[in-house]
Interface confidence: low
């Protein structure tokens, strides 16, 4: 390998290097490649040089395109017709000179916050692109359409958020925003101007025309209308609060919808239970006033008894299933019919047939095993399923089982 590299001179973006050749193993060196490493790089990386191609008789080169105020070390790698040799020992570590910052923060945005606030956020500039000590940000903002920028200096490289609080900030009003950079050398560029909205006022009017209906023992559907009067705060969605009659309202559960949806389904409820519901509009500032409360009682639970005594027969590519009628208990919903779920043994998707009888005829090919289960259904939802029945593939035309 070549002997250790010397850094003869260093500027903010360049480094003048020199080295002495090592033994060539009886095959002349045809070229040298310069590699650099920093605290921010993943291992050694090839760097651009002048001259661009360093021949085997050249023992000095200038590395270009370095980042200011970053600690570098360099090494050389020799190559000949046989291949690439071992790298040289690294040079000493040297820091490039400082320079004005050139990279602006990414993703300047913001919004939200509390009343009378303008929240501005951005992604910090990585340390290796700060170009010098004393790095910080200049946050510039102005009401949309106004001439004068308001400026705030944040003397911290880690700052990624600024909140302007002032009673003069109207709810949800647009501001032009840009974020610049500086370091000990002076000011760098600003990011492109973007529009950020100040904090909202929470909705001021309640939703109207609340209506709820029970879909089953476990599910309720709630409908409402947008507030009849114009809200001062924009509406991002609605919060539905619901609680059992025997519980306290402050312990209600809440679900939120997003956007202008004006209905939602509430699931995982108990059967035969009286629920109270109320709806509020919300946005990033909070929730508005509550609608009037409405009441709805979930339907009786579905039958808990599964179908029993299931018998099957097969003939002429048909399977005939019979089972005992399921009787609902007093506190259960009446049986409206039965669902027969079946699938081939190898098939993952299940097919369903509904019937109001206690028998069903399935036309199925006989070259497959079948898995079948039966469950009652009611206004309260689906009842308990029977055990799964496996009907083996039938080679002859007639078979039976239970």
């Amino acid at each position: 390998p070549p002997e250790a590299v010397t850094i003869d001179e260093i500027t903010d973006t360049t480094a003048q290097l020199s080295w002495r050749p090592g033994p060539d193993n009886h095959s002349p060196i045809t070229m040298y490649v310069i590699q650099a490493r920093t605290p921010f790089s993943v291992g050694w990386q090839a760097v651009s040089t002048v001259p661009e191609l360093i021949d085997g008789k050249t023992f000095t080169a200038t590395v270009v395109g370095l980042n200011p105020w970053v600690e570098y070390e360099f090494r050389t790698v020799a190559a000949n017709v046989i291949g690439i040799g071992e790298p040289s020992r690294p040079s000493e570590k040297r820091r490039t000179e400082e320079a004005l910052p050139e990279v602006t923060p990414a993703n300047v945005s913001g919004g939200g916050g509390s009343k009378s606030e303008l929240v501005i956020t951005w992604e910090t500039v990585p340390e290796e692109l700060q170009n010098g000590r004393g790095f910080g940000y200049v946050v510039a903002f102005r009401p949309y359409g106004k001439m004068i920028w308001m400026l705030t200096v944040l003397a911290s490289a880690d700052a990624s958020r600024y909140v302007f609080r002032n009673e003069s900030v109207h709810p949800f009003s647009p501001f032009e925003v840009k974020v610049g950079v500086f370091n000990n050398k002076g000011e760098g560029p600003f990011s492109p101007t973007t529009v950020v909205y100040s904090a909202e006022e929470e909705p001021t009017k309640p939703p109207a025309s609340i209506f709820a209906r029970s879909l089953s023992a476990t599910d309720i559907e709630v409908f409402w209308a947008s507030p009849l009067e114009k809200n001062r705060g924009r509406i991002q969605g609605y919060e539905v609060k619901y609680w059992r009659h025997e519980d306290k309202e402050e312990n209600a559960r809440k679900i939120r919808t997003v956007g202008n949806q004006t209905s939602t389904k509430i699931t995982n409820l108990k059967g035969s239970v009286l629920y109270h519901l109320a709806v509020k509009a919300y946005n990033s500032a909070g929730t508005g006033p509550s609608s009037a409360t409405v009441n709805v009682t979930t339907r009786k639970p579905p039958p808990s008894q599964p179908p029993g005594n299931i018998i099957w027969n097969s003939s002429d590519s048909k399977i005939i299933l019979n089972w005992d009628q399921v009787k609902a208990l007093d506190n259960e919903s009446e049986v409206k019919g039965y669902k027969v779920l079946y699938r081939w043994n190898r098939q993952s998707s299940t097919s369903v047939i509904e019937t109001n009888k206690t028998s069903v005829e399935l036309s199925l090919p006989f070259d497959e095993d079948y898995i079948i289960e039966i469950k009652p259904f009611s206004d309260g939802g689906d009842g308990s399923s029977s055990e799964q029945i496996r009907i083996p593939k039938i080679s002859n035309a007639y078979a039976r089982g239970s």
Partner: antibody, heavy 123, light 101 residues
Framework: EVQLLESGGGLVQPGGSLRLSCAAS????????MFWVRQAPGKGLEWVAE????????WYAPAVKGRFTISRDNSKNTLYLQMNSLRAEDTAVYYC????????????????WGQGTLVTVSS | ELTQDPAVSVALGQTVRITCSGR???YGWYQQKPGQAPVLVIY???NRPSGIPDRFSGSSSGNTASLTITGAQAEDEADYYC?????????FGGGTKLTVL
């Protein structure tokens, strides 16, 4: 006085199973949602599962869904957690806990906690 | 996901505010001391369980909740976790270590 006493923890190999129990006393067990919450050594709290008072509704963290089953026997005032296909990352102290009110919901209102039982998954 | 500052310090007798940001239908706050189980100090945003000193209070606005300790005491030094839910998932914040100086 509310008391929750966990048991069933111990050392188990990856892929193995374990069943935790929690004996509850001092409150009307069937009226309250119950929880399992875990805490890996030196780490924060992680919600595992929740079950409604009657046992009809269950909720699971995505990390355990399909592997863990929460259940309860209201006649015995006991909460269970069946843990299958255990992984090294399931190693933690597992706490049994109860909701603050008869229908307070979720991790916003867990009012009483057991002292925890340590589950170690290691080969 | 609920986000908390990893560490906060307060001088003895002063007021400290611990925040928790992220969507939740409701927020709760838990205090945990080394080797002990957590203790609920605030539930459903603002409610204080019996036995919790009134120097602990909770509030929420939008997608942020706050636990305020007015006149912090030495025994308040602990880890504090926020908890909440969204849809069918419950979640805890990463915890804030409170040091009382």
């Amino acid at each position: 006085e509310v008391q929750l006493l966990e048991s069933g923890g111990g050392l188990v190999q990856p892929g193995g199973s374990l069943r935790l129990s929690c004996a509850a006393s001092g409150f009307t067990f069937s009226s309250f949602n119950m929880f399992w919450v875990r805490q890996a050594p030196g780490k924060g709290l992680e919600w595992v599962a929740e079950i409604s008072g009657g046992g009809g509704s269950t909720w699971y963290a995505p990390a355990v869904k399909g592997r863990f089953t929460i259940s309860r026997d209201n006649s015995k005032n006991t909460l269970y957690l069946q843990m299958n296909s255990l992984r090294a990352e399931d190693t933690a102290v597992y706490y049994c806990a109860k909701s603050a009110d008869t229908w307070s919901y979720g991790a916003a209102s867990i009012s009483a906690w057991g002292q925890g039982t340590l589950v170690t998954v290691s080969s | 996901e609920l986000t908390q500052d990893p560490a906060v310090s307060v001088a003895l007798g002063q007021t400290v505010r611990i925040t928790c940001s992220g969507r939740s239908g409701s927020y709760g706050w838990y205090q945990q001391k080394p080797g002990q189980a957590p203790v609920l100090v605030i539930y459903d945003n603002t409610n204080r369980p019996s036995g919790i000193p009134d120097r602990f209070s909770g509030s929420s606005s939008g997608n942020t909740a706050s636990l305020t300790i007015t006149g912090a005491q030495a025994e308040d030094e602990a880890d504090y976790y926020c908890g909440g839910y969204w849809g069918s998932t419950d979640v805890f914040g990463g915890g804030t270590k409170l040091t009382v100086l």
